[in-house]
């Protein structure tokens, strides 16, 4: 009844304040869209949250938001503004009937709008709890002390923060925007509700069972006592991060976000602008055996999504369901039996498991590298984390065999020592979305704003490709690869790496036609290749020609066949030296690879020649990996000769620089 | 220091088993295909097999398809040889060796190479 009240006050002032003279028409040619969860029993219909167009200020988001309660009143219909966003991202969240979706779609400013969803824990079963002793020995686990110069900031349930483990290191916010527990006989009680917060809490930093010993958080209550939260709760609950940090700047912030719902485009969003205002957003991968790109904020390019694995280097499974894989996770961390703190009394303790536990371990990794490094940047801490993991540890027969590929082999670890690596030279692999199997299909695989794409290649299972190309896009390069007729679809492969007032540009040689073959070269001073792509618009390149081979003494070259248009990859960055290593072999197989020497970097991998039983190639840490069709589809003819071709970079700047830092 | 340190290695009698582990130490192992070569009295030294740095793929001399096995655990560092049905043919000293392609069967082309293990396989 009281709520009724406030909806009709509020239509009342809309109607009010309603002017016809404020009437702006929607601009033309742009339409927008309407998104909500893909999975049906996390729908919350009759919550909206319209987002608006970039540049909309709050006095604008203000009058648009009334503008749709007055149109919505004369048509009979009541609504209720909940939350006006500014900060993050303009818009507001709006409960109203979906009738007047059509309505708000047409209004001025409007970007996109999104239905309300619900977002879950993830730590299963994470209120179903095995106590270990009170007296717990401190003695199994002596993490090094760090994190002091961090914040850390945790969107979850409730927390006892009088816990031992965490007493003085979690400042309890007054944020909370939590969904109605579900069932009518929920009963609250209080260690239930506080059990997942506080067990990552510790896990984050606790006394004894602590990754980041030093690090100080603050908590956000965005989930219930039942771990279900909601997009908006979680959308306000990252607004209020993002004011809090403009009105008292402190340190590096982590946001820790330890939860799970379906793909959401406005959730993405904002992590998005989150994370380019320069703070760290780590998320649970989700605990649905599924691919992690279908879930939110797991799916964000610009968060460091993690899943778990056990102690034995396993994914971990979670009853009939385990850990998220495939390209939008980052690494892994342990995620089986975690010992931390307990809600059910203040010095009990638990273990938990799922990706939720994952994340906090990542988050403490994080606090540790920003403590020891303040001015890492996102994407250099993003760097850091792959390079100091434990490579290719995990079991791979886990995921389905169509994921393999796509998910990352590593395992975080805290760096052997907290004087960062300023030298080396940083690189990671970028998977692309899958194409789809139409003749024309492409896939686009992109660094963040602050890496350069050194080196683009492609992969098809059928083998069916035609190729790939680093293009520029909005004033940056991508990586695009194209499909083929009758191929089932393709994956763009970018390396992406940091490398400081690089200047990197695109050399292009159309096809040679001639039996040479073609060829392209960094022609500029002090430019050196970083990496060759090649792309051809026939269905098939002949399996009749035998792979073109570099001439000795010519580095700085991209060769392929003579039917495509090669592109270098030419780079001028202070102290950047690169070589080509080649490794072929004249009889068929199904995997050849190439890796640089210790010091050296990966920069770019490709395959010669380009023909159909080539899969593609691509960058798994510093090897260059070819792979063709089986070897028993393939005749051991000269078909089946193939080269794998690394270009191997090191930076002697970033090396001497960080000799002078010593 | 790289370090490549082979064991398990012994008497067996034919058509029996026997399991040899190489440890790598001062190298990033996960970046290096490891390979097991073998070398009898007064012969060269021959390829047995290889794995890949990625994705476990493997490469085998003919002679022992079907009966060897490489398999290595990048968390240990190491590599192993499951060498099933011996043969007295098989009876030499084992070497482990690290290089960064894959597959390679010259030993030349291997960056490093441990002491050897002495495996005899009595009639």
């Known amino acids: 009844q009281e709520d009724e009240d406030g909806d009709y006050e509020e239509l009342v002032l809309a109607l009010r304040s309603e002017e016809d003279g404020l009437a702006e028409a929607p601009e033309h040619g742009t339409t927008a869209t309407f998104h909500r969860c893909a999975k049906d029993p996390w729908r919350l219909p009759g919550t909206y949250v319209v987002v608006l167009k970039e540049e909309t200020h709050l006095s604008q988001s203000e009058r648009t938001a009334r503008r749709l309660q007055a149109q919505a009143a004369r048509r009979g219909y009541l609504t209720k503004i909940l939350h006006v966003f500014h900060g993050l991202l303009p818009g507001f969240l709006v409960k109203m009937s979906g009738d007047l979706l059509e309505l708000a779609l047409k209004l001025p400013h409007v970007d996109y709008i999104e239905e309300d969803s619900s977002v879950f824990a993830q730590s299963i079963p994470w209120n179903l709890e095995r106590i270990t002793p009170p007296r717990y020995r401190a003695d199994e686990y002596q993490p090094p002390d760090g994190g002091s110069l961090v914040e850390v900031y945790l969107l979850d349930t409730s927390i006892q923060s009088d816990h031992r483990e965490i007493e003085g290191r979690v400042m309890v916010t007054d944020f909370e925007n939590v969904p109605e527990e579900d069932g009518t006989r929920f009963h609250r009680q209080a260690s239930k509700c506080d059990s997942h917060g506080t067990h990552l809490a510790g896990v984050v930093s606790g006394r004894d069972a602590g990754v980041a010993k030093g690090a100080s958080m603050r908590s956000l209550r965005v989930l219930n006592c039942q771990g279900k939260g909601t997009v908006s709760g979680t959308l306000i609950g990252l607004e209020f991060i993002r004011k809090s940090q403009l009105v008292q700047p402190v340190g590096p912030l982590v946001v820790l976000l330890p939860l799970a719902g379906g793909y959401s485009r406005v959730l993405n969003a904002a992590c998005q602008r989150l994370a380019r205002a320069g703070v760290v957003l780590v998320t649970a991968a989700g605990n649905f055996r599924d691919d992690a790109c279908l879930y939110s904020p797991a799916s964000a390019p610009e968060v460091i999504t993690v899943g778990a694995t056990n102690a034995q280097d396993q994914p971990v499974t979670l009853g009939t369901l385990g850990t998220n894989f495939g390209r939008c996770v980052d690494l892994f961390a342990p995620g089986e039996d975690i010992i931390g703190a307990s809600s059910d009394c203040s010095t009990c303790f638990v273990s938990q498991s799922g990706t939720s536990q994952a994340a906090a371990h990542v988050a403490g990794i994080a606090a540790m590298m920003l403590s020891a490094e303040p001015e890492l940047t996102l994407a250099e801490l993003r760097q850091r984390l792959i390079h100091f993991s434990a490579k290719d540890v995990i079991n791979e027969a886990w995921f389905p065999e169509d994921q393999r590929v796509l998910t990352p082999n590593l395992v975080a670890a805290l760096p052997p020592s907290t004087h960062g690596a300023g030298w080396q030279l940083f690189c990671r692999t970028v998977w692309s979305a899958h194409s789809g199997p139409t003749r024309m299909a492409t896939a686009v695989a992109r660094c963040a704003p602050d890496e350069e794409l050194l080196s683009c290649s492609s992969f098809s299972r059928s083998g069916k490709r035609r190729g790939e190309r680093m293009e520029a896009q909005g004033g940056k390069l991508v990586c695009r690869a194209h499909n083929a007729f009758g191929g089932e679809g393709v994956y763009a492969i970018a390396r992406c790496c940091l490398l400081p007032q690089a200047n990197c540009s695109v050399h292009t040689a159309p096809p040679a036609e001639a039996s040479m073959g073609t060829r392209v070269h960094c022609h500029q001073q002090g430019h050196v290749l970083t990496g060759c792509s090649s792309h051809w618009e026939v269905e098939d390149l002949g399996t009749h020609k035998p792979p073109v081979l570099r001439p000795r003494g010519q580095p700085n070259q991209c060769v392929g066949h003579r039917e495509a248009s090669i592109h270098a990859s030419c780079c001028h960055a202070p102290g950047l030296e690169c070589k080509v290593k080649e490794h072929g072999i004249p009889a068929p197989q199904e995997q050849v690879t190439v890796a640089c020497e210790e010091g050296w970097t990966l920069t770019g991998c490709s395959a010669l020649p380009g023909t159909s039983h080539v899969l593609g190639a691509y960058a798994v840490d510093n090897t260059c990996v070819v792979r063709s069709r089986d070897v028993s589809t393939t005749g051991s003819t000269s078909e089946g000769a193939v080269t794998a071709v690394a270009i191997c970079c090191r930076s002697r700047h970033l090396a001497q620089a960080s000799q002078e830092l010593q | 220091q790289v370090k490549l340190e082979e064991s398990g290695g012994g008497l067996v009698q034919a058509g029996g088993s026997l399991r040899l582990s190489c440890a790598a130490s001062?190298?990033?192992?996960?970046?290096?295909?490891m390979g097991w070569f073998r070398q009898a009295p007064g012969t060269e030294r021959e390829f047995v097999g290889q794995i890949s740095q990625v994705d476990g793929f493997t490469y085998y001399e003919d002679s022992v398809k079907g009966r060897f096995t490489i398999s290595r655990d990048n968390a240990k560092n190491t590599v192993y040889l499951q060498m099933n049905s011996l043969k007295p043919d098989d009876t030499a000293v084992y070497y482990c060796a690290a290089a960064l392609a894959f597959p390679t069967t010259s030993s030349n082309t291997y960056a490093y190479s441990g002491q050897g293990t002495q495996v005899t396989v009595s009639s």
């Open positions: 001062g190298l990033t192992f996960s970046n290096y295909a």
